[in-house]
Interface confidence: low
């Protein structure tokens, strides 16, 4: 019988397999009783990805300057063009069709991990002796003085939002 | 269903041109099949003569090709087949086909 | 060219016995993608050739599943596992790997 089910690399056409056209280029014609498919390489700006029976490459991405995006990784005829954004944002989904600015931690929040061209800031709550007192997408929660190592005192405690104050010693007569 | 049907004169003169035309029905010639020309002389076995695809690219039996012309008609979705110089060798049933189907063939005899 | 040689050149059969031709081929058919362009071809008395099988081993549709071919590199074979009396003909392999397609010389397959 013709078969029902083709090898890998391979498909299925009017009762014969043919095989599959490798990434980067197109179908042109299917094979018959006595020619192979027939493939054409993707012009400059297109690709296909896999082993595959397209009529038409895919197109690149475009990585639009007005949404915030520049190439990271120019595309060829086997791979798309993978996409970034510009300094100080990032890609608003996986997909990185836009870009938006990176948010910044608020008093009492430090940055755990910085952002990327693809993630966002990660804020964490400053812990106890630890503050931030300003709102940054770069800053980390920094200790509290030591008021102990200038040889002054606490005068005022520390919040996750504000650094302890010193002061000097009551000096006892 | 796939048909062919070839037709053209039964008699040819010695010396002159043999010409055949193959329609097709039931299926474009524009699609990606090799068309054949093939004959069979009487109480013998077969020969394959060449192919042409519809674009007009072709190849042809060495033991014929410089008396062989084949072209193509897309608009009556019909191709053809001219052979030169023929004597009475050349006297067979002539079959189009795309080997998956083939016309019922027309004897052409040369003769004076 | 390649040169297909068909054996025996004449077959009788019981009816509802085997039968089996061999057909090849003076060098490889398999071609650099891993494909062997081998056809068989059955011709009743007084009709034009009707493909039964492609590429070795595949039938074409509306060919009953008593014929089979098999075969790799230039030794090829076709069975007929029950012969019936519609079968009497003259079969011929073709190959259409290499330019110029060349046939067998034909097996002529007669009940006994």
């Known amino acids: 019988e013709p078969p029902t089910a083709c090898r890998e690399k391979q498909y299925l056409i009017n009762s014969q397999c043919c095989s599959l056209c490798q990434p980067g280029q197109k179908l042109v014609s299917d094979c018959t009783e006595f020619t192979e498919t027939e493939c054409l390489p993707c012009s400059e700006s297109e690709f296909l990805d896999t082993w595959n029976r397209e009529t038409r490459c895919h197109q690149h991405k475009y990585c639009d300057p007005n949404l915030g995006l520049r190439v990271q990784q120019k595309g060829t005829s086997e791979t798309d063009t993978i996409c970034t954004c510009e300094e100080g944002l990032h890609c608003m989904s996986e997909s990185c069709e836009s870009c938006v600015p990176h948010r910044s931690c608020l008093p009492g929040f430090g940055v755990k991990q910085i952002a990327t061209g693809v993630s966002d800031t990660i804020c964490e709550p400053c812990p106890v002796g630890f503050f931030s007192n300003v709102s940054s997408a770069f800053e980390k929660c920094r200790p509290w003085t030591s008021c102990e190592t200038k040889d002054l005192v606490v005068q005022q405690a520390g919040t996750n939002k504000t650094d302890v104050v010193c002061g000097p010693q009551d000096r006892q007569r | 269903q796939v048909q062919l049907q070839e037709s053209g004169p039964g008699l040819v003169k010695p010396s002159d041109t043999l010409s055949l035309t193959c329609a097709v029905s039931?299926?474009?010639?524009?699609?990606?099949?090799?068309w054949n020309w093939i004959r069979q002389p009487p109480g013998k076995g077969l020969e394959w003569i060449g192919y042409?695809?519809?674009?007009?690219?072709?190849n042809y039996n060495p033991s014929l090709k410089n008396r062989v012309t084949m072209s193509v008609d897309t608009s009556k979705n019909q191709f053809s087949l001219k052979l030169s110089s023929v004597t009475a060798v050349d006297t067979a049933v002539y079959y189009c086909?795309?080997?998956?189907?083939w016309g019922q063939g027309t004897l052409v005899t040369v003769s004076s | 060219d390649v040169v297909m040689t068909q054996s025996p050149l004449s077959l009788p059969v019981t009816l509802g016995q085997p039968a089996s031709i061999s057909c090849r081929s003076s060098?490889?058919?398999?071609?650099?993608?891993?494909?062997?362009?081998l056809n068989w071809f059955q011709q009743r008395p007084g009709q034009s050739p009707r493909r039964l099988i492609y590429?070795?081993?595949n039938r074409f549709s509306g060919v009953p599943d008593r014929f089979s071919g098999s075969g790799s590199g230039t030794d090829f074979t076709l069975k007929i596992s029950r012969v019936e009396a519609e079968d009497v003909g003259v079969y011929y392999c073709?190959?259409?790997?290499?330019?110029?397609?060349?046939f067998g010389q034909g097996t002529k397959l007669e009940i006994k």
């Open positions: 086909a795309r080997l998956d189907y």
């Open positions: 039931g299926y474009s010639i524009t699609t990606n099949y090799y």
């Open positions: 042409i695809n519809y674009d007009g690219s072709n």
């Open positions: 060098q490889s058919l398999e071609n650099s993608n891993g494909n062997t362009f």
């Open positions: 590429k070795v081993s």
């Open positions: 073709l190959q259409v790997t290499h330019v110029p397609f060349t």
